[in-house]
């Protein structure tokens, strides 16, 4: 396990943004349901510009985006850019 300079928080997101992140700049999305000491759903997005950001799970644009990505992943074989998993 690598030592980290930052505090090991139970929740990873100390703040979230609600502003729209365009699908064309998204590299990965991770939706982490409540659990492991964090009582809330967390949505983390990795962008193609090498940034990682926390997004408001209730943002309407995000709900539309997740539905769009999941419907695409059901109808095609390439690996879906959305992963749903619990925090390690």
């Amino acid at each position: 396990i690598l030592e980290a300079h930052y505090t090991n928080l139970k929740c990873r997101c100390s703040g979230v943004i609600s502003t729209v992140v365009g699908l064309n700049i998204i590299d990965r999305i991770q939706v982490t349901p409540p659990g492991n000491g964090c009582p809330k759903t967390e949505v983390v997005i990795w962008t193609k510009m090498k940034k990682v950001i926390c997004v408001n799970p209730r943002a309407k644009w995000l709900q539309r985006l997740l539905r769009h990505v999941q419907s695409k992943s059901l109808s095609s074989t390439p690996q879906a850019p959305v992963s749903k998993r619990r925090a390690a």
Epitope: A4, Y6, C13, G15, I17, E42, K51, V52, C54
Partner: antibody, heavy 122, light 107 residues
Framework: QVTLKESGPEILQPSQTLTLTCTFS??????????VGWIRQPSGKGLEWLAN???????YYNPSLINRLTISKDTSNNQAFLKITNVDTTDSATYYC??????????????WGQGVMVTVSS | DIQMTQSPSSMSASLGDRVTITCQAS??????LIWFQQKPGKSPRPLIY???NLANGVPSRFSGRRSESNYALTISSLESEDMADYHC?????????FGAGTKLELK
């Protein structure tokens, strides 16, 4: 344990090319989200970000120096490199190799090397 | 580029003093700011990330806060080991930019 160590010439002349090597351990540049960069600090002055290179070979440069900088990596040997062409005395500084990892919370430059002092003098 | 205006450039304070260093961003950086501490002859290390979160092993006398585009680092009661240079960094967008640094000395 994460460590980074810079190496390169201590002194060089104006118009020469500076090549710096960062040798690191405790992490690899292969996994998703891992990056290495370079930051410099002239003696008694502030810090200046120069360049980053990521696991997927994506490169970012400081626009004020972009025409003179080249960052590269050798993933299998855990090394990163920075080349600065046509150096002059204003390039005299301590050069740091730094690690960044795209995890949340994202703390760029979470680990630093000890730095290597480079002097450009005629 | 985003400019980070850090002040003061240097200051002297006594042990036990409350010390505040500020950085002003030329545009909205949405808390994407880190404070680094650099002791003499050493490499910088992260003190505070996302403007207000304390890094691992950092004493609780250090704190960070934001007021609009102004970001502040405060040491509530200065200790001798806090004598160092302090740097702010914005990582909202490339190119990442640092403030000019603050040298904190003992009065």
């Amino acid at each position: 344990q994460v460590t980074l160590k810079e190496s390169g010439p201590e002194i060089l002349q104006p118009s020469q090319t500076l090549t710096l090597t960062c040798t690191f351990s405790g992490f690899s540049l292969s996994p998703y989200g891992m990056g290495v960069g370079w930051i410099r600090q002239p003696s008694g002055k502030g810090l200046e970000w120069l360049a980053n290179i990521w696991w997927d070979d994506d490169k970012y440069y400081n626009p004020s120096l972009i025409n003179r900088l080249t960052i590269s990596k050798d993933t299998s040997n855990n090394q990163a490199f920075l080349k600065i062409t046509n150096v002059d005395t204003t390039d005299s500084a301590t050069y740091y190799c730094v690690r960044s990892e795209l995890v949340m919370p994202y703390v760029p430059f979470d680990y630093w090397g000890q730095g290597v002092m480079v002097t450009v003098s005629s | 580029d985003i400019q980070m205006t850090q002040s003061p450039s240097s200051m002297s304070a006594s042990l036990g003093d409350r010390v505040t260093i500020t950085c002003q961003a030329s545009q909205d950086i949405e808390n994407d700011l880190i404070w680094f501490q650099q002791k003499p002859g050493k490499s910088p290390r992260p003190l505070i990330y996302y403007a207000t979160n304390l890094a691992n092993g950092v004493p609780s006398r250090f704190s960070g806060r934001r007021s609009e585009s102004n970001y502040a680092l405060t040491i509530s009661s200065l200790e001798s080991e806090d004598m160092a240079d302090y740097h702010c960094l914005q990582f909202k967008q490339y190119p990442y930019t640092f403030g000019a640094g603050t040298k904190l000395e003992l009065k």
